[in-house]
Amino acid sequence: MMTGTIETTGNISAEKGGSIILQCHLSSTTAQVTQVNWEQQDQLLAICNADLGWHISPSFKDRVAPGPGLGLTLQSLTVNDTGEYFCIYHTYPDGTYTGRIFLEVLESSVAEHGARFQIP
């Protein structure tokens, strides 16, 4: 039975040209995290394998930095980065947990962070 929950940074906004940290946290389970994938709907951004370390997709290598922790830092943001991001936790023995973050990249200098929320 999957008892865990993923807490994410929720709906967030950031300025064009700036950077943002995408963070998820898995709680309420003793399952072992074997790998975390960071994805958009149609493509892989990065993988953090607990044993083998990080893989960053070549199309993001210039502006994605691993961490902090299992998170991902997106740099040099453009308005095209607006959209949904998913953290996919591969765990043993529970299976897969998925968290969702919506990022809005703003032209203006007003970029307020949304509240954190949980996805069961």
Epitope: T34, Q35, N37, E39, D42, Q43, L44, I47, N49, A50, D51, L52, G53, W54, H55, I56, S57, P58, S59, K61, P66, H90
Partner: antibody
């Protein structure tokens, strides 16, 4: 340039163990993950497992869990793969392969080590 | 484990032909697929990664495409040195798995 040089061919009896080395050069040893892949005669490629030289973290294919052991010696920039309880179906060419910085693609390969298991 | 199914298993072509090899993953692997070339008695060589980037020094006649579960590897004009076996591999999750290989032979 990046080089992976493996130890020579081995002939072993069933039940024995074999330990193959993979000496690397041309890059910072702790920056690239090292993997082991085998190929039985006339067959395809099979991933055995990988090791992160930075922290010693290992990942194995289930088939080899408990029978293969991957280690590294940072002082000599060398990776090792030991396979125990050998059987005839373990006869294969064993390759070490390096994946680049923040990458899982196997960009660098050793020349291969033929292990023959025969009574 | 993720299965990678390659087709065809063998392929005959003449120099100058355009050839296409396909690889199907048993589940979504996004863009985490690479292609290798192997010649008899030699170690594999990385050709294409993620899955449309040519590795350093790889000629432009080699290309790759696809995302999700379906991937394609193409040689636009086969050269004599291209006759070899080609493998796809996924690195979306461990264990990293290979296709069974496609042997490209001279017609």
């Amino acid at each position: 340039q990046v080089q992976l040089v493996q130890s020579g061919a081995e002939v072993k009896k069933p039940g024995a163990s074999v330990k193959i080395s993979c000496k690397t050069s041309g890059y910072t040893f702790t920056e690239y993950t090292l993997h082991w892949v085998r190929q039985a005669p006339g067959q395809g490629l099979e991933w055995i497992g990988g090791i992160n030289p930075n922290n010693g973290g290992t990942s194995y294919a289930q088939k080899f869990q408990g029978r293969a052991t991957l280690t590294v010696d940072k002082s000599t920039s060398t990776a090792y793969m030991e396979l125990s309880s050998l059987r005839s179906e373990d006869t294969a060419v064993y390759y070490c392969a390096g994946s680049g910085y923040y990458d899982y693609s196997f960009a660098y390969w050793g020349q291969g080590t033929l292990v023959t298991v025969s009574s | 484990d993720i299965q990678m199914t390659q087709s065809p298993s063998s392929l005959s072509a003449s120099v100058g032909d355009r050839v296409t090899i396909t690889c199907r993953a048993s589940q979504d692997v996004k863009n985490a697929v690479v292609w290798y070339q192997q010649k008899p008695g030699k170690a594999p060589k990385l050709l294409i990664y993620s899955p449309s980037y040519r590795y350093t020094g790889v000629p432009s006649r080699f290309s790759g495409s696809g995302s999700g579960t379906d991937f394609t590897f193409t040689i636009s004009s086969v050269q004599p040195e291209d006759f070899a076996t080609y493998y796809c591999q996924q690195h979306y999750s461990t264990p990293f798995t290979f296709g069974q290989g496609t042997k490209l032979e001279i017609k």
